[in-house]
Interface confidence: low
């Protein structure tokens, strides 16, 4: 974690890295390790991969503890074999339209990715394709049973996944602000990104949050009782403490968490909040980190396509974020 | 007490190979890097390189072509070899133990180049 | 990878001094301190931005923000005379600032 003690390293010869990822010297120039790679956690001890223009982002001082392997200023993105220069905006696909800063590249859906819950009178609706439209729209499969359970006051339920248009105009700016990326993890700590320029200067800048989707020991199907499909946000039963490379959150959280779906489709957070937490390290500092906090999740068969290079990459956003 | 003796020549001519040895005593040899920094007359220190219990190296880039560091666990020694000497690496030639910073040094060695 | 330090200061008996040492970024790493007395070896005085080790007198005293790392001697005696060096890793190699001078008049 800091290198205030003498090298513990495993016995040489050095690890065995993958492919195109470099064997660098430990942050206490102490033991020779994997360097992390583009949007990965760092800490001194993890350093990121300097041969590809990598450093370790902690953010404000104080909080140097953990980082996350950021692209130096003004590096260009690689995307579906396209290389795009640092403030370049590019379309995807007439799905999104994009950004790259600094190595990294954020993304605004042009379809809406809203999601449509089940209700009486639409218990199956259905994203499809429709001949000569980009943006895939929602259809109701005819329910088996054509009895209408309960008065049918609405056509459906669309939750409405926006706030505010993202697009604002202040003081000669043009506001735009990407939606949150798919935590990089599905279980466990992991790191969500996205690209704003909702600042002072109005300068595009990348901003990362940790996210936790479902803790990597939950056996959550097991808990789905018999004859439900799902348990779309099952609450952790007891406050948990969070951990991040060895340093454990000050506080306890009643965190929601996102469950699965045993028919095939895809359980994901819906709408997300981010909120700070203190964390505590054993040397006795603490760091101040962004998280991501989930109120809903969803199940829907919205899931990413292997063809859909941005959506097998990002294959799910966080809507309705309130920071 | 940690303490870190070194020796070697003093005196070099021109395209001549530097070479000094460096002595732990009353220490764990097997947990750090074993550096070794210079300093010219009157200037800053320069990091050279160093070795790790299992010989593994890090050597500065602008050094690393003629730079050799060794080590020999049996004796709790380390070594440095410096190739094709010149002028400019006259300096004063410091061992030093290393985790994250450089804990202990050696007493120095004054080496000068001349022909 | 370059670290910038002022070249000399002067402080007076019992007073504070503070020495900065500049680099990119040197924030994000963790910044040491070396004192080095005329004739003498380097001994080191504060490690990762603000530790001392054992030994050395609780009027030093080490942070690192921003691109700026200071060391602070408060209460400064004659024998705190003496070259000081900052130093710092980056990319694998250690680096060196080019020292700053403290006579204590």
């Known amino acids: 974690q800091n290198c205030s003690g003498p090298c513990r390293c495993p016995d040489e010869p050095a690890p065995r890295c993958p492919a195109g990822v470099s064997l660098v010297l430990d942050g206490c120039g102490c033991c020779r390790v994997c360097a992390k790679q583009l949007g990965e956690l760092c800490t001194e001890r993890d350093p990121c991969d300097p041969h590809k223009g990598l450093f370790c982002h902690f953010g404000s001082p104080a909080n140097r503890k953990i980082g996350v392997c950021t692209a130096k200023d003004g590096a260009p993105c690689i995307f579906g074999g396209t290389v795009y220069r640092s403030g370049e905006s590019f379309q995807s696909s007439c799905k999104y339209q994009c950004t790259c800063l600094d190595g990294a590249v954020g993304c605004m859906p042009l379809c809406s990715m809203d999601v449509r819950l089940p209700s009486p009178d639409c218990p199956f609706p259905r994203r499809v394709k429709l001949p000569g439209k980009c943006c895939e729209e929602w259809v109701c499969d005819e329910p088996k049973d054509q009895t209408v359970v309960g008065p049918a006051l609405a056509a459906y339920r669309l939750e409405d996944t926006f706030g505010p248009d993202p697009t604002m105009i202040r003081a000669n700016c043009l506001v735009q602000t990407t939606e949150w990326s798919a935590c990089s993890k599905t279980c466990g700590m992991g790191i969500s990104t996205r690209v704003t320029n909702d600042n002072a200067s109005c300068r595009l800048e990348k901003q990362s949050r940790l996210c936790m989707v479902r803790p990597c020991e939950a056996d959550l199907e097991e808990n789905i009782k018999k004859g439900k499909k799902c348990i779309r946000t099952p609450k952790i039963s007891k406050p948990i403490k969070f951990e991040l490379s060895g340093c454990t959150s000050m506080k306890t959280y009643r965190a929601k968490f996102c469950g699965v779906c045993t028919d095939g489709r895809c359980c994901t957070p819906h709408r997300t909040t981010t909120l700070p937490v203190e964390f505590k390290c054993p040397d006795g500092e603490v760091m101040k980190k962004n998280m991501m906090f989930i109120k809903t999740c969803a199940c829907h068969y919205n899931c990413p396509g292997d063809n859909d290079i941005f959506e097998s990459l990002y294959y799910r956003k966080m809507y309705g974020d309130m920071a | 007490q940690v303490q870190l003796q070194q020796w070697g020549a003093g005196l070099l001519k021109p395209s001549e190979t530097l070479s000094l040895t460096c002595a732990l005593y009353d220490g764990s040899f097997s947990d750090y890097y074993w550096s070794w920094i210079r300093q010219p007359p009157g200037k800053g220190l320069e990091w050279i390189g160093e070795v790790n219990r299992s010989g593994g190296t890090n050597y500065n880039p602008s050094l690393k072509s003629r730079v050799t560091v060794s080590v020999d666990t049996s004796k709790n020694q380390f070594s440095l070899k410096l190739r094709s000497m010149t002028a400019a690496d006259t300096a004063v030639y410091y061992c030093a133990r290393r985790y994250g910073s450089f804990e202990y040094w050696g007493q120095g060695t004054t080496v000068t180049v001349s022909s | 990878y370059v670290l910038t330090q002022p070249p000399s200061v002067s402080v007076s008996p019992g007073q504070t001094v503070s020495i900065t040492c500049s680099g990119d970024?040197?924030?994000?790493?963790?910044a040491s301190w070396y004192q080095q007395r005329p004739g003498q070896s380097p001994i080191l005085v504060i490690y990762q931005d603000t530790k001392r080790p054992s030994g050395i007198p609780e009027r030093f005293s080490g942070s690192n923000s921003g691109n700026t790392a200071t060391l602070t001697i408060s209460g400064t005696q004659a024998m705190d005379e003496a070259d000081y060096y900052c130093?710092?890793?980056?990319?694998?190699?250690?680096?060196f600032g080019a020292g700053t001078k403290v006579t204590v008049l």
């Open positions: 130093q710092a890793w980056d990319s694998n190699t250690a680096f």
């Open positions: 970024k040197l924030g994000n790493k963790y």
